[in-house]
């Protein structure tokens, strides 16, 4: 599942990781936009051994596979779910 | 060529302990996630865990996760199998198994011949 | 959990025959299906990947295809060394095997 999170929080990332994840172990992917207290793009992956991951966006593997997810969003929807917190 | 050779399993008793290796050749262990898959007698395959390339993050079937502990020696090229408080039902063929490496689309593709383990008193 | 209904559970076949085996997945797997060919006394060996992607030197008489939650794995010109257990893996999320096929030859 991808999501999509617009929020007033400052940066939750301290540390990024461009290291691979196979999608098998892979539960959901949050995406953090820049702004609003936070000057980058964060993407955190929540894995299936209950474990987060901060995964470095210019992350080619990321990148890839967060184009499969929007690619199979917009033929099957819900899936991935878009959240927006409105601070 | 690839090769994945499991130590010697054997007969243990119940409650008690065990530790199985296997020692891979032929590519380069560090840039390959591992698991073990293990088939009980007259069944089918079973996952039982696997190891990410320098052992920092691990994954187990749910039922095992409290007595089974992925390790790995990326300086041996060894990759390990701590099995505790065993029970009758973990009796099985225990198989090392090289996962994916870089490529979401690739499964589990080189296997060893297996290891027995007999859990009886 | 995904959970991966594999059918039959035995058959038998001709030399020469055809053969197709089935794997349902309780839910989509998005194409990551693999395919193994198990033998006693051996580890199993793996066929296909990603539905349809052959494995280097495995022959062309096998096959798979499938998408959504069904699959399917055929063996074409059966030869005698075909005989073994065949089993589906679905690694979409974690892994889960079917319960395999044994296949004779009549």
């Known amino acids: 599942v991808l999501e999509v999170y617009y929020t007033s929080l400052r940066c939750r990332c301290v540390q990024e990781s461009s290291v691979f994840i196979p999608r098998r172990f892979i539960d959901r992917i949050q995406i953090l936009p820049r702004g609003n207290g936070c000057p980058r793009k964060e993407i955190i992956v929540w894995k299936k051994n209950k474990s987060i991951v901060c995964v470095d966006p210019q992350a080619e593997w990321i990148q890839r596979m967060m184009e499969v997810l929007r690619k199979r969003s917009s033929s099957t929807l819900p899936v991935p779910v878009f959240k927006r917190k409105i601070p | 060529e690839v090769k994945l050779v499991e130590s010697e399993g054997g007969l243990v008793q119940p409650g008690s302990s065990m530790k199985l290796s296997c020692t891979a050749s032929?590519?380069?262990?560090?840039?390959?996630?591992m698991a073990w898959v293990r088939q009980v007698p007259e069944k089918g395959l079973e996952w039982v865990a696997n190891?990410?390339?320098?052992?920092?993050?691990?994954y187990y079937l749910d039922s095992l996760k409290s007595r089974f502990i992925i390790s790995r020696d990326n300086a041996k090229n060894i990759l390990y199998l701590q099995m505790s408080s065993l029970k009758s039902e973990d009796t099985a063929t225990y198989y090392c198994?090289?996962?994916?490496?870089?490529?979401?689309?690739?499964?589990?593709?080189?296997w060893g011949q297996g290891t027995s383990v007999t859990v009886s008193s | 959990d995904i959970q991966m209904t594999q059918s039959p559970s035995s058959l038998s076949a001709s030399l020469g025959g055809k053969v197709t085996i089935t794997c349902k997945a309780s839910?989509?797997?998005?194409?990551?299906i693999a395919w193994y060919q198990h033998k006693p006394g051996k580890g199993p060996r793996l066929l296909i990947h990603?539905?349809?992607t052959l494995q280097p030197g495995i022959p062309s008489r096998f096959s798979g295809s499938g998408s959504g939650r069904d699959y399917s794995f055929s063996i074409s010109n059966l030869e005698p060394e075909d005989i073994a257990t065949y089993y589906c893996l679905q690694y979409d999320s974690l892994y889960t095997f079917g319960g395999g096929t044994k296949l004779e030859i009549k």
């Open positions: 032929g590519f380069t262990f560090s840039d390959y996630y």
């Open positions: 190891i990410n390339y320098d052992g920092s993050d691990t």
């Open positions: 839910q989509d797997i998005n194409k990551y």
């Open positions: 990603y539905t349809s």
């Open positions: 198994v090289r996962d994916v490496a870089y490529d979401d689309s690739y499964a589990m593709d080189y």
